[in-house]
Interface confidence: low
């Protein structure tokens, strides 16, 4: 009888009640798998899931969420509400990102901005809910006599050139030379 | 309980904006979403969208290009404005809250009776 | 967009009646099929989601069916307070779309 079972291909079952060995699965059920002595019952996709694929007799049905709500888990076990940019989702429900977080994301936790400092870089953008600080050069890149050697490009907002990059550098520039002669004039007052 | 309060005008001149504000109480519009439907004699039940919890927005894509519905989770208000109305957008507008366990509406305001008239 | 046709505008019953009001779907919508009630002067309430899950607090004499394209709500002993309009709702996608009711009188 085992090796008569091993015949039954996908979508039927090894009935040993019948004399027709294998019996096609009954209706809202499937097996996906050959010489199985059960149909398993097709998942049903209510409330918050709706059917992304249809169960057929060889395979299970395919949940998704309905709109407003997102998928968690293997195989879309869960359905979790959707929250907008800048917010995350707690037991009360959507909340904004405190100050220092962000989630650029309908899903999912407020993470902390980047820390530009360690990486020995400065903020060029500053960071909001919904969107990550910009780190740009590092202050020594900045400097006069600086290396010439290019440092990679940030990741940038749109609308942030580079041409901004280089006012900051020249600024940066003509303020260390406006304080250079501020202390030389300091001095020379104090000789006199 | 739970209760959906409108409040907005009657009569609206074609061409011109409807605006109607949706007071909820009882339920909290960071936990449930907000639909807005409209019923009138020749069209029957129209669903025009619906704001989530989250603030996210759908729309009914016959009505995207002229609708809003924006909300003020701190004053428990959802604000439905439709621009360039005309005489066929006569209807009852409806707001309605959307439960946790479907797109469906299980409670619903009073309704607001629009007249596009000159 | 989906159409839901209630073919039915209205339907006679008596007090203790079983009564059957058909919703079909212009295509596929699975289980995702809502059924309300509107009372005269009342404001419209879910009975029915997901074609046959109660929504609480639902009298267990209502009861949703179907799947894909035909979909039934049943009452079963009708009520005298049950006398009302039905509309079938579909939230497989948008739009979301109605039925055009189905109106409960008495014989």
């Known amino acids: 009888l085992q090796d008569l079972c091993s015949n039954c291909p996908a979508g039927t079952f090894c009935d040993n009640n019948r004399s027709q060995i294998c019996s096609p699965c009954p209706p809202n059920s499937f097996s996906s798998a050959g010489g199985q002595r059960t149909c398993d019952i097709c998942r049903q996709c209510k409330g918050v899931f709706k059917t992304r694929k249809e169960c057929s007799s060889t395979s299970n049905a395919e949940c998704d969420c309905i709109s407003g709500y997102h998928c968690l888990g293997a195989e879309c076990s869960m359905c979790e509400q959707d929250c907008k940019q800048g917010q995350e989702l707690t037991k009360k429900g959507c909340k904004d990102c405190c100050f220092g977080t962000f989630n650029d994301q309908k899903r999912g936790i407020c993470r902390p901005w980047t820390n530009c400092s360690l990486d020995g870089k400065s903020v060029l953008v500053n960071g909001t809910k919904e969107r990550d600080v910009v780190c740009g050069p590092s202050p020594a890149d900045l400097s006069p006599g600086a290396s010439s050697a290019t440092p990679p490009a940030p990741a940038r907002e749109p609308g942030h050139s580079p041409q901004i990059i280089f006012f900051l550098a020249l600024t940066s520039t003509v303020v260390l030379f406006l304080l250079f002669f501020l202390v030389l004039d300091y001095k020379d007052d104090d000789d006199k | 309980q739970v209760q959906l309060k409108q409040s907005g005008p009657g009569l609206v001149q074609p061409s011109q904006s409807l605006s109607i504000t949706c007071t909820v109480s009882?339920?909290?519009?960071?936990?449930?979403?907000v639909h807005w439907v409209r019923q009138s004699p020749g069209k029957g039940l129209e669903w025009l969208g619906v704001?989530?919890?989250?603030?996210?927005?759908d729309y009914n894509a016959a009505f995207i290009s002229r609708l809003s519905i924006s909300k003020d989770n701190s004053k428990s208000q959802v604000f439905f404005k439709m621009n360039s109305l005309q005489a066929d957008d006569t209807a009852i507008y409806y707001c309605a809250r959307n439960p946790l366990t479907a797109t469906v509406m299980d409670y619903w305001g009073q309704g607001t009776s629009v007249t596009v008239s000159s | 967009d989906i159409v839901m046709t209630q073919s039915q505008k209205f339907m006679s019953t008596s007090v203790g009646d079983r009564v059957s009001v058909t919703c079909k779907a212009s295509?596929?919508?699975?289980?995702?099929v809502a059924w309300y009630q509107q009372k005269p002067g009342q404001s419209r309430t879910v009975l029915i989601y997901s074609a046959s899950y109660r929504h609480s607090g639902v009298p267990d004499r209502f009861t949703g069916s179907g799947s894909g394209t035909d979909f039934t709500l049943t009452i079963s002993n009708v009520q005298s307070e049950d006398l009302a309009e039905y509309f079938c709702?579909?939230?497989?996608?948008?739009?979301?779309?109605f039925g055009t009711g189905t109106k409960l009188e008495l014989k």
């Open positions: 009882g339920f909290s519009l960071t936990s449930y979403g």
């Open positions: 295509q596929n919508v699975g289980t995702n």
């Open positions: 709702q579909q939230y497989n996608s948008y739009p979301l779309t």
């Open positions: 704001i989530w919890s989250g603030g996210s927005t």
